[in-house]
């Protein structure tokens, strides 16, 4: 039975040209995290494998940095980066947990962080 929950940074906004940290945290489970995949739509941004380290997709290599932790730093933001981002936690023995973050990239400097929320 999957007992874990993923806490994410929720709905966030950031300024065009700036950077943002995408962060998820898995709690309420003793399952072992074997891998975390970061995706935008059907595009892979990066994978953090517990044994092998980080793989950044070639499409994002110039503006995605691993970390902090299992999170991901997205740099040189453009308006086209607005949208849904997913952290997919591969765990043993539970299986897969998915968290969602919505990022809005703003033209002006009125970017504010949204509230944190949980996905069961």
């Amino acid at each position: 039975m999957m007992t874990g929950t993923i806490e994410t940074t929720g709905n966030i906004s950031a300024e065009k040209g700036g950077s943002i940290i995408l962060q998820c945290h898995l709690s309420s489970t003793t399952a072992q995290v074997t891998q975390v995949n970061w995706e935008q739509q059907d595009q892979l941004l990066a994978i953090c494998n517990a044994d092998l380290g980080w793989h950044i997709s070639p499409s994002f290599k110039d503006r995605v940095a691993p970390g902090p932790g299992l999170g991901l730093t997205l740099q040189s933001l453009t308006v086209n980066d607005t949208g849904e981002y997913f952290c997919i936690y591969h765990t043993y023995p539970d299986g897969t947990y998915t968290g969602r973050i919505f990022l809005e990239v703003l033209e002006s400097s009125v970017a504010e962080h949204g509230a944190r929320f949980q996905i069961p």
């Epitope: 074997t34 891998q35 995949n37 995706e39 059907d42 595009q43 892979l44 994978i47 494998n49 044994d51 092998l52 380290g53 980080w54 793989h55 950044i56 997709s57 070639p58 499409s59 591969h90 897969t96």
Partner: antibody, heavy 120, light 106 residues
Amino acid sequence: EVQLQESGPGLVKPSETLSLTCAVSGYSMTSDYWNWIRQPPGKKLEYIGYISYSGRTYYNPSLKSRVTISRDTSKNQFSLKLSSVTAADTAVYYCARGDYSNYGGAMYDWGQGTTVTVSS
Amino acid sequence: DIVMTQSPDSLAVSLGERATINCRASQGVSTTIAWYQQKPGQSPKLLIYSASYRYTGVPRFSGSGSGTDFTLTISSLQAEDVAVYYCQQYYSSPFTFGGGTKVEIK
């Protein structure tokens, strides 16, 4: 140029242990990760597992109870042991190198393969 | 495990013509797809990684797709392209391969 060379007995009796070695030349095994893959006659490639640059191992759950992958960095080689073999383990066995940072799970240097037949 | 299904099983194409091979994943695998070429009696060789990136020194071949559906295209078939082609996912462990597509000259 990196070269991988599999070696080991071509014939193994049922219920015995299959032992193969992959000798790596032209590159140090202290980085990247090192894989075993097999191909039964007329069937698709099957992933067996890996040993990482740090010595951590992953085994395909379908074979996990029977598989051990180890390494000897002083000899720049890694090994596969598969216990309690049956005719279904008859296959061409390949070793291969991966660079997770750049290529993820794509394996880009392969040995020529060694044929192992399980028969009494 | 993620099941990779290739189509067609075999393909006969005239020299200089385009060859297209399809690969479908049983669940979404984003862009974590590699393609390999295996000539008779040889080991597999990496052609494409991350669904669409050509490995060093690979000509004529291109890859596309994301999610569950992927394509390998040989733009102009040459005699040396006769081989079996395999897709592989590395979205999650264990890595899994398609059943292969045999490409021949018509």
